[in-house]
């Protein structure tokens, strides 16, 4: 039969070469002389000349040692031809399998492997995987089967078997409890890879295991107690910086401190923030403290971390004794703005009101008073009692100083502290109207024709308030009623002046008496220019000859 079973040839053969492997034989050689040849990679194509065949005998020859790691199998074709070159057989498939020798050591894929694991993890936790390769065969032989092992561990704390490596997968795992970043932040393992499944050649590499931080350390106050002095009334005042130590990784959430006032701040007077760089707790006043109400506060502050604790840890507490310093506080007028009703025009020396201040300080400080702003100079204030009296005539109708019936005065109180402090109060005098102004006509100069004169309408004004105003009454005096009439309109707020007899062109005084609803009378002289004209006129026509 023109068939050859697969041929196995060990790699790295010693020879001698050429080495006979197998004989090709066609049964057609009984009839005719047969010539044998081979083709294929390793014969007539690259790598050429590895194999040859004795042309007449059919012996398959190996010309040099084989390398399985280069070519593990050769597929050749055997040919049989007669003397005339005619093919006597179909090409025959020749498989040459190169069998493995353990001629390669394992090689790690990296010189140094890096991995990490959280501190405090349980045994069995996977850390990392290392890999070594071996070019030898690992399917049919153990030549390329790599077994992994840990040769050494540095440091050997808390003991020298903190990790294990899976002998076939290269997975490094934690085998013992006690990984503590704060004691050992990094382990260096010398790892081995050995072929022949652990019985052959060995190579080494390094695995560096970084121990990652977990929040397994509570921040601790150092010191745990503080004494501070704070001025009363100060807001945003730094009271104290609280210092903590934390063994966890700096600037990590497990290290960054969070402060909480646990007790002693009943009035919510204090606040505490974390300094972003130093991690200190900055205790400041959120509201002003009151020495007179409470001169000492004892605060209790607890510290934790931004990250939660990974195990139950006792929290550290600090005590801060805050002495509140007495500050000489300004007297405060009660009320800060005082409204007092007073009649205008009260006699000089008449009391207006008593306006006093209270001193928040507990010592019996003496308070003295004075007027700070009195635009019209109408008032005086007793420095000891705070009694305000009239020293000028209070005039409601004084438009320069009085707005909407109110006269505004600013007063000052000063204590005898060291240094002295002052407080101000506003006194708003609501001036009650008295009927101290009579009605006044407007305008007080008129021009009128002596023939068919037009009635002159004069507006009546009274600076007083109702009921000391309209309805008004009008009366002509000093014989003015011989030539003139004066009548108040129905609304009672204007007076109509009429010329009832002919007067020659000239200027005349009309004596008009107006009285208000409270019978306050005001005599006004109206200057009347009479012109030689008819009806309405604004100025006299023609040359003026009046005297």
């Amino acid at each position: 039969d023109w068939v050859v079973a697969p041929i196995s040839v060990p790699e790295n053969g010693k020879g001698p070469f050429p080495q006979r492997l197998n004989q090709l034989k066609s049964n057609k050689d009984r009839d005719t002389k047969i010539f044998y040849s081979i083709t294929g990679p390793g014969a007539d194509s690259p790598p050429e000349g590895v194999f040859a065949v004795e042309k007449e005998t059919g012996w398959l020859l190996l010309n040099k040692p084989l390398d399985r790691e280069e070519i593990a199998k050769y597929e050749l074709f055997g040919h049989a031809v007669s003397e005339n070159g005619a093919s006597v057989e179909d090409p025959m498939n020749i498989s040459i399998i190169v069998t493995d020798q353990n001629d390669h050591k394992p090689k790690f894929t990296q010189d140094t492997f890096r991995g990490s694991v959280l501190e405090g993890v349980l045994p069995g936790t996977s850390v990392m995987q290392v890999t070594a390769t071996d070019e030898d065969d690992a399917i049919y032989t153990y030549n390329g089967v790599v077994a992994y092992s840990i040769h050494s561990q540095e440091p050997k704390d808390p003991h020298d078997l903190m990790f294990t490596i899976h002998r076939s997968t290269g997975t490094i795992s934690v085998i013992s409890s006690g990984l503590d970043r704060e004691k050992v932040p990094e382990y260096t393992l010398t790892i081995q890879a050995t072929d022949m499944d652990g019985d052959g050649s060995t190579t080494t590499a390094v695995a560096v295991v970084e121990i990652l931080d977990a929040n397994d350390n509570a921040p601790m106050f150092d010191p745990q107690k503080y004494e501070a002095h704070v001025p009363e009334n100060a807001v945003g005042h730094e009271v104290q910086r609280l210092t903590v130590t934390d063994l966890d990784a700096p600037n990590s959430p497990a290290w960054r401190a969070t402060y909480l006032i646990m007790g002693g701040d009943d009035g919510d007077h204090f606040t505490i923030t974390t300094h972003p760089e130093s991690n200190q707790g900055i205790l400041t006043t959120r509201k002003g403290l009151d020495f007179e109400a409470k001169n000492q506060h004892t605060l209790y502050v607890e510290v934790t971390n931004e990250a939660p604790f990974v195990l139950k840890l006792p929290t550290s507490t600090a005590t801060i004794v805050v002495h509140v310093e007495d500050v000489n506080e300004a007297p405060v007028f009660v009320p800060p703005s005082k409204v007092v009703e007073v009649q205008e025009g009260i006699p000089t020396g008449e009391p207006v009101c008593v306006y006093t201040a209270e001193d928040p300080d507990k010592e019996n400080q003496k308070i003295s008073y004075r007027i700070l702003r009195d635009p019209a100079g109408w008032l005086a204030m007793d420095p000891d009692s705070g009694q305000v009296t009239a020293v000028g005539t209070l005039d409601r109708e004084d438009e320069q100083f009085v707005r909407n019936n109110i006269y505004e005065v600013m007063v000052l109180a000063m204590d005898n502290g060291s240094p002295p402090t002052t407080g101000t109060g506003t006194l708003l005098l609501t001036l009650i109207d008295v009927n101290d102004h009579g009605p006044v006509p407007e305008p007080r100069q008129i021009t009128i024709c002596n023939q068919s004169p037009v009635r002159q309408v004069l507006n009546i004004t009274d600076k007083d308030l109702s009921p000391h105003t309209s309805p008004f009454q009008a009366q002509l005096t000093d014989d003015s009623d011989i030539y003139w009439t004066a009548e108040v309109n129905e609304e009672g707020d204007t007076v109509v002046l009429s010329l009832k007899k002919f007067l020659k062109q000239d200027t005349y005084d009309v004596h008009l008496s107006l009285s208000d609803h409270g019978n306050k009378e005001q005599l006004t002289v109206i200057r009347a220019t009479v012109c030689d004209c008819h009806g309405h006129v604004e100025t006299c026509p023609g040359p003026w000859k009046g005297g």
Epitope: P223, Q224, P231, E238, R241, H323, E325
Partner: antibody, heavy 118, light 103 residues
Framework: QVQLQQPGAELVKPGTSVKLSCKSS????????IHWVKQRPGHGLEWIGE????????YYNQNFKGKATLTIDKSSSTAYMQLNSLTSEDSAVFYC???????????WGQGTLVTVSA | QIVLTQSPAIMSSSPGEKVTMSCSAT?????MYWYQQKPGSSPKPWIF???NLASGVPTRFSGSGSGTSYSLTISSMEAEDAATYYC?????????FGGGTKL
Amino acid sequence: QVQLQQPGAELVKPGTSVKLSCKSSGYTFTSYWIHWVKQRPGHGLEWIGEIDPSDNYTYYNQNFKGKATLTIDKSSSTAYMQLNSLTSEDSAVFYCARSGYGNLFVYWGQGTLVTVSA
Amino acid sequence: QIVLTQSPAIMSSSPGEKVTMSCSATSSVTYMYWYQQKPGSSPKPWIFRTSNLASGVPTRFSGSGSGTSYSLTISSMEAEDAATYYCQHYHIYPRTFGGGTKL
């Protein structure tokens, strides 16, 4: 008025220890902390530590841990500082002080001159 | 710890002159405190919280500064002001003093 009284001087031998006193009067002794300050001749001031008379809580400057020990006797309103293993470096004036207005060391004792000499 | 450096270490002045001495901190502090000491006497509180004069301190003295740089100024030197002045910080432990400026 507030007073802190200290003895004027102490002469001690090297290797021994000395206990300095600071007697307070004129205020409630347990309400304010007592501080201790060292001043070597021609040198500046060094804060040693502090003690709260209300509960004997102490806090030391690291440079003086093991060297100084602060204690209190409430019954006599007296603060004490013991200095151990004395050497010539410990020859100095030691002041006690009390904090007050403005966080200042407002009240100071007159100081005790400690001379360490064989 | 925070180190306070005072400069100059020694200075002299005539009556009526303006005097300024400085205190530099290795890291930021909120307030600075100053003491005056004369030979044979205990230190006296002089300036608190950077700029406030302690009781009985003449108004010719003033204090200023922030962060890491502070100073004490005498507007018009008088003979009684001759002394050593120490700066101190309070809020961060350990409480430290500067080396002093001898005026």
